[in-house]
Interface confidence: low
């Protein structure tokens, strides 16, 4: 498949009722659009037994299965069932393939691990596939920032990568917040760096034929404490269908220990605002940043009453920050079908 192509099953016509099981390999990052039945009476898509909502990153909508950008967790078995019956119109398994060609730093198609290639000859010692991405040797970043080191490589057999810090094996176990090793991207990620993270980081890439290494230098610049910083665009305006689950995300960066609160704006006596001009709110969740998943507000099985404005508010000893988003709740797409199959539920 070319990078610009979508995965498609066309045309969007009613397929034969004796639909054979298919297996499709999809590259990471690739858009997917699969058709099932005629557009106006398309079937309903299910993943691993759960019906897909018509809104969201992965959606089943008017007979189409649409995935904006294929991720590893999107792999699995997908069924399309005819409306009002249990007839299988499509039965397919999506398998994760290689990454697409992309200028995105996270993706590295030339350096993927290809199992079919693992023992093919001739053998080749590891080599850097994108040395131009490794030219920045010294990384001087403010405390609290995220640092990513990458050593994209290839070879035959496919090499392995490990990391050293100041010459010692580095797994991040002594580091608050740990580290993320993304082997398929040949990367080491450290979030919220602190002065003790300073040092020389070495990527060591090796296979049976040979090994190569490269050093990065990290300097962490200390800074004065600041009020919490909320990632722009979060929480994001979201549209969901009645009965589906919603996650609102609020990413908080703070030197000083922050508290986070999720608020829902409510109406009292027909008004959203008090006499002082400030909004009425209901507190949904409150905790400090160390609490698990406090940065995510989960809304299960949403109803029309859940629609409205939600605010993520973060405060620390320096100050406050908060941002809001709107949740729009759409009516269920096809209530007659839902009644016929009560076990079906929306997941997003």
């Amino acid at each position: 498949l070319e990078a610009s192509e979508e995965v498609e099953l066309e045309p969007c016509l009613a397929p034969s009722l004796e639909q054979q099981e298919q297996e499709l390999t999809v590259a990471l990052g690739q858009p997917v659009r699969l058709c099932c039945g005629r557009a106006e009476r398309g079937g309903h898509w299910y993943k691993e037994g759960s019906r897909l909502a018509p809104a969201g990153r992965v959606r089943g909508w008017r007979g189409r299965l649409e995935i904006a950008s294929f991720l590893p967790e999107d792999a699995g078995r997908y069924l399309c069932l005819a409306r009002g019956s249990m007839i299988v119109l499509q039965n397919l398994t999506l398998i994760t393939g290689d990454s697409l060609t992309s200028s995105n730093d996270d993706e590295d198609p030339k350096s993927h691990r290809d199992p079919s290639n693992r023992h093919s000859y001739p053998q080749q010692a590891p080599y850097w596939t994108h040395p131009q991405r490794m030219e920045k040797k010294l990384h001087a970043v403010p405390a609290g920032n995220t640092v990513k080191f990458r050593c994209p490589a290839a070879g035959n057999p496919t090499p392995t990568i490990r990391w050293l810090k100041d010459g010692q094996a580095f797994h991040g176990e002594n580091r608050i917040g740990g580290i993320r090793l993304r082997h398929q991207h040949w990367s080491l990620v450290m979030e919220s760096v602190v002065p003790s993270d300073r040092g020389t980081y070495t990527c060591l890439v090796e296979n049976a034929v040979g090994s190569i290494r490269y050093n990065y230098l990290l300097d962490v610049l200390e800074r004065s404490p600041h009020r919490p910083i909320l990632q722009a665009g979060l929480p994001a305006n979201t549209t969901a269908v009645v009965g589906s689950d919603v996650e609102l995300l609020c990413k908080v960066y703070s030197d000083a220990q922050p508290h986070i609160q999720w608020l829902k704006h409510i109406v009292i006596n027909g008004s959203s605002f008090g006499a002082d001009g400030f909004p009425y709110v209901q507190v949904l969740k409150t905790a400090d940043i160390n609490s698990s998943e406090v940065e995510v507000l989960y809304l299960r099985n949403v109803s029309a009453e859940d629609a409205g404005e939600y605010t993520c508010l973060a405060g620390n000893s320096i100050g406050l920050s908060y941002q809001s988003a709107w949740l729009t709740v759409l009516p269920e797409e096809d209530p007659t079908w839902t009644a016929a199959a009560p076990e079906a539920r929306y997941t997003d």
Epitope: Q261, V283, L313, I318, L320
Partner: nanobody, 128 residues
């Protein structure tokens, strides 16, 4: 207009305790933060502690008072309290009660940026 009435200041020896209280009256909002700032002679007014109306347990504290001071509030009385233990000479200052409510959709700033109303100061002196 919101009026703030602070009380509880006084003279205490190092290691001693005091409890400040601040009552808000007038057109108060229930989506608010109330708290305390202090100002020592010749120094800038600095944040001490604050608490939200919808979070009766969690307070925000300046590093210099963490573990020694505890803020609490009684929403029914629109009153905020500051329990000050293990007082030190460097805690000597005029303590000001502060009141803030949130703008509508988003915002950020240091605590002082949010203050809409200040109470009159109450003097705290820690000396042997």
């Amino acid at each position: 207009e919101v009026q703030l009435q602070a009380s509880g200041g006084g003279f205490v020896q190092p290691g001693g305790s005091l409890r400040l209280s601040c009552a808000a009256s007038g057109r108060t909002s229930w989506l608010t933060t109330m708290g305390w700032f202090r100002q020592a002679p010749g120094k800038e007014r600095e944040f001490v502690s604050a608490i939200s109306s919808f979070s009766s347990k969690q307070g925000y504290y300046a590093d210099s008072v963490k573990g020694r001071f505890t803020i609490s509030r009684d929403n029914s009385k629109n009153t905020v309290y500051l329990q000050m233990n293990s007082l030190r000479a460097e805690d000597t200052a005029t303590y000001y009660c502060a009141y803030a409510s949130y703008p509508r959709h988003q915002g950020n700033g240091r605590w002082k940026d949010f203050v809409e109303y200040w109470g009159q100061g109450t003097q705290v002196t820690v000396s042997s």
